[in-house]
Interface confidence: low
């Protein structure tokens, strides 16, 4: 059966989590990836942006994990215009923002 | 309002044991993960002890490890520190201190007590 | 076990920005959280998850984490604002939290 969405959330803050404490070198060699804009549609926005980071086991669970919050299917190469126009960071920094506003989410009840 | 109300402490001679208490109220204690943390005389903080809101796990500063026991009782609202085989190290300010709970994680000390003085000395 | 490095003290005038450093290795990657305590009080939450405030707190107080330093900036500093500072953060591989040695504020 479908998990709830806030238990779904949760256990996407707590990979989350795990990645961002386990660090010993910089996450993923140090890819670049695409900011996004995490007011709207923030799932898609991620998945589309991580999922052109290949070859980094840390962040499969992420990448599988945020296929099942999008609707839609995403491919390597897709943007949408979530983007933040040409501003790219580390896959580490990505994460830990991703983090913090998905906590937010939690916070207040925002669970899809 | 919500608040934490640390009970306990007192002065004692190295080798002896002390019961701390934390009384909560005001909040839904049962979701959130309690700390102990300590405070020397003019010195910095030092945590202490960590009990998840379930009460399924701890974790203890190395400096008490085997020594302190950290308890909850969500029925009634109180967090426990037994202390055991005290030193003239562990004089402190005792704080009581919750978080919000993450697995794997624990959040900023959103809401701490006022403080019990644990004084050891012969 | 993780180290948090401050400076023992840090010294403003009124009105200036403070600025407060709390050094860590790849703290970037860890979420940062900030104390402040006056004389004979418990400690109180400034500055959460590096840069996010709880509603009592002034906008004065703000925070950044990156590299191998968080920070916590305090602008326009007050009288009021002399205290103690810590960082804090948990540290996963020891599954202990972890604060900082603190920092004397001091407004000139």
């Known amino acids: 059966s479908p998990v709830p969405p806030s238990t779904a959330l949760k256990e996407l803050i707590e990979e989350l989590v795990n990645i961002t404490q386990n660090q010993k070198a910089p996450l993923c060699n140090g890819s670049m990836v695409w900011s996004i804009n995490l007011t709207a549609g923030v799932y898609c926005a991620a998945l589309e942006s991580l999922i052109n980071v290949s070859g980094c086991s840390a962040i499969e669970k992420t990448q599988r994990m945020l296929n099942g919050f999008c609707p839609h299917k995403v491919s390597a190469g897709q943007f949408s215009s979530l983007r933040v126009r040409d501003t790219k960071i580390e896959v580490a920094q990505f994460v830990k923002d991703l983090l913090v506003h998905l906590k937010k989410l939690f916070r207040e009840g925002q669970f899809n | 309002q919500m608040q934490l109300v640390e009970s306990g402490g007192g002065v004692v001679q190295p080798g002896r044991s002390l019961r701390l208490s934390c009384a909560a109220s005001?909040?839904?204690?049962?979701?959130?993960?309690m700390h102990w943390v300590r405070q020397a005389p003019g010195k910095g903080l030092e945590w202490v002890a960590v009990?998840?809101?379930?009460?399924?796990?701890?974790h203890y500063a190395d400096s008490v490890k085997g020594r302190f026991t950290i308890t909850r009782d969500n029925s009634k609202n109180t967090l426990n520190l037994q202390m055991n085989s005290l030193r003239a190290e562990d004089t402190a300010v005792y704080y009581c201190?919750?978080?919000?709970?993450?697995?794997?994680?624990?959040?900023?000390?959103?809401?701490w007590g006022q403080g019990t003085m644990v004084t050891v000395s012969s | 076990s993780y180290v948090l490095t401050q400076p023992p003290s840090v010294s403003v005038a009124p009105g200036q920005t403070a600025r407060i450093t709390c050094g860590g290795n790849?703290?970037?990657?860890?979420?940062v959280h900030w104390y402040q305590q006056k004389p004979g009080q418990a400690p109180v939450l400034v500055v959460y998850?590096?840069?996010d405030r709880p509603s009592r707190i002034p906008e004065r107080f703000s925070g950044s984490n990156s590299g191998n330093t968080a920070t916590l900036t305090i602008s326009r500093v007050e009288a009021g604002d002399e205290a103690d500072y810590y960082c804090?953060?948990?540290?996963?591989?020891?599954?202990?939290?972890?604060f900082g040695g603190g920092t004397k504020l001091t407004v000139l």
């Open positions: 201190a919750r978080a919000p709970q993450w697995y794997l994680s624990a959040e900023a000390f959103d809401l």
């Open positions: 005001g909040f839904a204690f049962r979701t959130y993960g």
């Open positions: 009990i998840w809101y379930d009460g399924s796990n701890t």
């Open positions: 790849l703290i970037g990657s860890k979420l």
């Open positions: 998850d590096d840069s």
């Open positions: 804090q953060v948990w540290d996963h591989s020891s599954d202990h939290v972890v």
